[in-house]
């Protein structure tokens, strides 16, 4: 006769491991008992369980409640056992020793491999700001056994670097994603993808990129300077900019306070019916946590009674 087993049994952490040991005997041969032991190199054998033809299953105290026979029906030549709720410490070499009549004793070894699926974590890097050089956008760490694979899935252009730390029974892999921040990256997903043999499917963690920036400011409303004449109603100036975080707007008049009746509504400056006192230099001040910009315009309200033409200067400053 001969023993049938597996060279390697692989289970995921927390699952039950079937340790196979089947005696393929000749007609009339009987199995008296099957002794299971853990036999890691450099350590003495540690008894796991004994499967006795008369007495049934005896589990050693160290494995009490964790070793069982597979569910019926059972073949009397089958000495397989179930190791319940496999933990990382169970990984190692196991031996089944089968006592048969009349053929004598047989033994076989197998290796139990316990896969520890990773629980990845993604950590965003420092705040991204337009104008920075190559900057850490995020790092992704996953620890498992064996070492997991960590990659990135994104439309954003960048570079990756990985490092690995080996522990006694596992390995931690950290991958970093670096990029040169630009406003076009705002709202783009950056996804860490972790692959591992203990996972049914890849684990994905997505981070949405936020890049701080503030665009140049400009003022609209003076494109047709002939419209800025005394008595005109509904005249307004609009300050144009964009940024992340969204900017706030503030209007001032460089050559004095804002005339009475002029309304400030965020990025818009609304005028009452125009008079010559509305002529002047107006400044739009745009700011967010990242930066601030100014744009100034000169308003010259025309008097139709006068022949002199209106002149408008647009000056933008940052």
């Amino acid at each position: 006769g001969e023993l049938e087993t597996s060279d390697v049994v692989t289970v995921v952490l927390g699952q039950d491991a079937k340790l196979p040991c089947f005696y393929r005997g000749d007609s009339g041969e009987q199995v008296g008992q099957v002794a299971w032991a853990r036999v890691d190199a450099g350590e003495g054998a540690q008894e796991l369980a004994l499967l006795h033809s008369k007495y049934g299953l005896h589990v050693s105290p160290a494995y009490e409640g964790r070793v069982e026979q597979p569910p019926p029906p059972r073949n009397p030549l089958d000495g397989s056992v179930l190791l319940r709720n496999a933990v990382q410490a169970d990984e190692g070499e196991y031996e089944c020793r089968v006592s048969t009549f009349p053929a004598g004793s047989f033994q076989a070894r197998l290796r139990l491999r316990v896969l520890v699926p990773p629980l990845p974590s993604l950590n965003p890097g420092p705040a991204l700001e337009e104008g920075q050089g190559l900057t850490l956008a995020a790092s992704c760490t996953a620890e498992g056994s064996p070492a997991p694979s960590v990659t990135w899935d994104t439309e954003v252009k960048g570079t990756t670097s990985s490092r690995s730390f080996k522990h006694s029974r596992s390995a931690a892999v950290t991958s970093e994603f670096h990029l040169v921040p630009s406003r076009s990256m705002n709202g783009q997903p950056l996804t860490c993808v972790v692959s591992h043999p203990g996972l049914l499917q890849d684990q994905r963690i997505t981070h949405i990129l936020h890049v701080s920036f503030l665009a140049e400011a400009s003022v609209r409303g003076l494109e047709d300077q002939n419209l800025w004449h005394i008595g005109r109603e509904g005249a307004m100036l609009k300050c144009l900019s964009e940024g992340q975080p969204p900017p706030s707007y503030n209007w001032t008049r460089l050559d004095g306070p804002l005339p009475s009746g002029v309304r400030v509504d965020g990025d818009t400056l609304g005028f009452p019916p125009l008079t010559t006192e509305h002529s002047g230099i107006y400044v739009c001040h745009v700011s967010n946590e990242f930066s601030s910009r100014d744009s100034q315009v000169t308003v010259d309200v025309l008097d139709p009674q006068e022949d002199s033409g209106k002149q408008v200067d647009l000056v933008s400053a940052s």
Epitope: E47, L50, H52, K54, Y55, G56, L57, H58, S60, P61
Partner: antibody, heavy 122, light 107 residues
């Protein structure tokens, strides 16, 4: 025919010592582990100690640990129980018994001696 | 330690009766259970080992059953020489422990 004969029992004062012997015959003594089991007057059975075939492994009940020592002389086919620091509650008939199979845990006992009475009293 | 609980602690029966004694273990012991018979002034005698295997020389009217935690000793037809005290014993773990005994008396 398997025979186990105990001796060495008697009356002893609390704190005293006794050595029990069990002479085995009718089988290959070195093939079997052995045990001592006791029975207080009118009470049930209580396992005391066990020794492996070679004498290299032994176990004790918590109630006697540190006071009793089991040993065997395979050349004389004899089992011993050295009892020190005896207490009134050790009063019992002491039986030696043969273990059916040698395993590091558990056993059933297929042959027993007739017993020897140990009385601990002042 | 594993506790072994026998019931009943005593029973009265007549010759020819079918007698059943039960033994319950405080935790699973597979089939690591033996039954012994003891008569007054005598040493115990092994009747059943491995829960259900009859020891050589023991009459077939004795039988054992059970596995795990619940076990039974049955005497199919009580004979005069069967009046005695019966003990169950687990040997799954050290220390091996005995039940408190069941005394079978003549009715």
């Amino acid at each position: 025919e398997v025979q186990l004969v105990e001796s060495g029992g008697g009356l002893v004062q609390p704190g005293g010592s006794l050595r029990l012997s069990c002479a085995a015959s009718g089988y290959i003594f070195t093939n079997y582990a052995m045990s001592w089991v006791r029975q207080a007057p009118g009470k049930g059975l209580e396992w005391v100690s066990r020794i492996s075939q070679s004498g290299g492994t032994n176990d004790y009940a918590d109630s006697v640990k540190g006071r009793f020592t089991i040993s065997r002389d395979n050349s004389k086919n004899t089992l011993y129980l050295q009892m020190n620091s005896l207490r009134a509650e050790d009063t019992a008939v002491y039986y030696c018994a043969r273990q059916t199979e040698d395993r590091s845990y558990g056993y059933d006992l297929d042959y027993w001696g007739q017993g020897t009475l140990v009385t601990v009293s002042s | 330690d594993i506790q072994m609980t026998q019931s009943p602690s005593s029973l009265s029966a007549s010759v020819g009766d079918r007698v059943t004694i039960t033994c319950r273990a405080s935790q699973g012991i597979s089939s690591y259970l033996a039954w012994y018979q003891q008569k007054p002034g005598k040493a115990p005698k092994l009747l059943i080992y491995a829960a259900s295997s009859l020891q050589s020389g023991v009459p077939s009217r004795f039988s054992g059953s059970g596995s795990g935690t619940d076990f039974t000793l049955t005497i199919s037809s009580l004979q005069p020489e069967d009046f005695a005290t019966y003990y169950c014993q687990q040997h799954y773990t050290t220390p091996p422990t005995f039940g408190q005994g069941t005394k079978v008396e003549i009715k």
